[in-house]
């Protein structure tokens, strides 16, 4: 079952290492792939003393962790390199960091974890 799926045909492209990698620095990347596979956009960046440094943006291959994500949001707490992916054309144009801590559920039957 797939709800409200948005096709991704192009993504914002950026490569901070463009000279070494011999690519464009910025632009729009068409996303290619097998017809039976989904496509996504992604962004990776670093936070150096409060200053955002984009590492890469572009197309991302079919990845179930990117399904149903219309916005590019990194939710991991304090990653070394920030990463987000999303579905929809140019959805990686804007990206954000919204850390979500683990939710611990109180339980009436405490379980002793296996060693």
């Amino acid at each position: 079952a797939i709800l409200g799926r948005s096709e991704t045909q192009e993504c914002l492209f950026f490569n901070a290492n463009w000279e070494k990698d011999r690519t464009n620095q910025t632009g729009v990347e068409p996303c290619y792939g097998d017809k039976d596979k989904r496509r996504h956009c992604f962004a990776t960046w670093k936070n150096i003393s409060g200053s955002i440094e984009i590492v890469k943006q572009g197309c991302w291959l079919d990845d179930i962790n990117c399904y149903d994500r219309t916005d590019c949001v990194e939710k991991k707490d304090s990653p070394e390199v920030y990463f987000c992916c999303c579905e929809g054309n140019m959805c990686n144009e804007k990206f954000s960091y919204f850390p979500q801590m683990e939710v611990t559920q109180p339980t009436s039957n405490p379980v002793t974890p296996k060693p």
């Epitope: 079952a1 797939i2 709800l3 409200g4 799926r5 792939g33 097998d34 039976d36 596979k37 989904r38 291959l61 079919d62 990845d63 179930i64 962790n65 990117c66 399904y67 149903d68 994500r69 939710k75 991991k76 707490d77 990463f83 992916c85 979500q100 801590m101 683990e102 939710v103």
Partner: antibody, heavy 118, light 111 residues
């Protein structure tokens, strides 16, 4: 520490139903897709079902389509597998697995045994 | 229907090198299938060894390496040890939420 703890397995008659649960801890459950994988006695691993981060997209191997339903409760950090119309060939250890980016299974539970027999 | 194939069994001498392969019936395995490898000993849950073709999971010794060899994914174990005797499974992500496991390879470390 990431932990996945399956429960709900047991002995059931052919045609019966079971609901498996997988309690997750040690990571932000709602940020990751999850999957169920099973292993029949003496056989190899078989992917059964997967579910996206929101639960909006669900996927199944052909042999369980229409009989099994995967779901998740992100507020309870729990993954479920509702198994109906069970058959002898569904007898297996059922593992839940966390899916990381690049769509691989980075953590596994210890498994719960489902036996379908009359 | 996609079938992922692995060698059913393999033997290696202690200290030797072995390469297990993973192919499928509908074409060549490429990095876009995110090949991953798992080790399982009897009665235990699988352990993740390699993901995304060639990235070692944390805590996995560098004796284990992944690659694409020709049209197959490959797992190479160099300097095999007695405790490498296990079942090894490859998995391909076919896209659109579907994974397919190989049948597994039973690795025997001789001696």
């Amino acid at each position: 520490e990431v932990q996945l703890l399956e429960s709900g397995g047991g002995l059931v008659q052919p045609g019966g139903s079971l609901r498996l649960s997988c309690a997750a801890s040690g990571f932000t459950f709602r940020n990751y897709a999850m999957s169920w994988v099973r292993q029949a006695p003496g056989k190899g691993l078989e992917w059964v079902s997967g579910i996206s981060v929101t639960g909006g997209s669900t996927y199944y191997t052909d042999s369980v389509k229409g009989r099994f339903t995967v779901s998740r409760d992100n507020s309870r950090n729990t993954l479920y597998l509702q198994m109906n119309s069970l058959r002898a060939e569904d007898t297996a250890v059922y593992y839940c697995a966390k899916v990381y980016y690049s769509s691989f299974f980075d953590y596994w539970g210890q498994g719960t045994l489902v036996t379908v027999s009359s | 229907q996609t079938v992922v194939t692995q060698e059913p069994s393999f033997s290696v001498s202690p200290g030797g090198t072995v390469t297990l392969t993973c192919g499928f019936n509908s074409g060549s395995v490429s990095t876009s299938y995110y090949p991953s490898w798992y080790q399982q000993t009897p009665g235990q849950a699988p352990r993740t060894l390699i993901y995304n073709t060639n990235t070692r999971s944390s805590g996995v010794p560098d004796r284990f390496s992944g690659s694409i060899l020709g049209n197959k994914a490959a797992l190479t174990i160099t300097g095999a040890q007695a405790d490498d005797e296990s079942d090894y499974y490859c998995v391909l992500y076919m896209g659109s939420g579907i994974w397919v496991f190989g049948g597994g390879t039973k690795l025997t470390v001789l001696g």
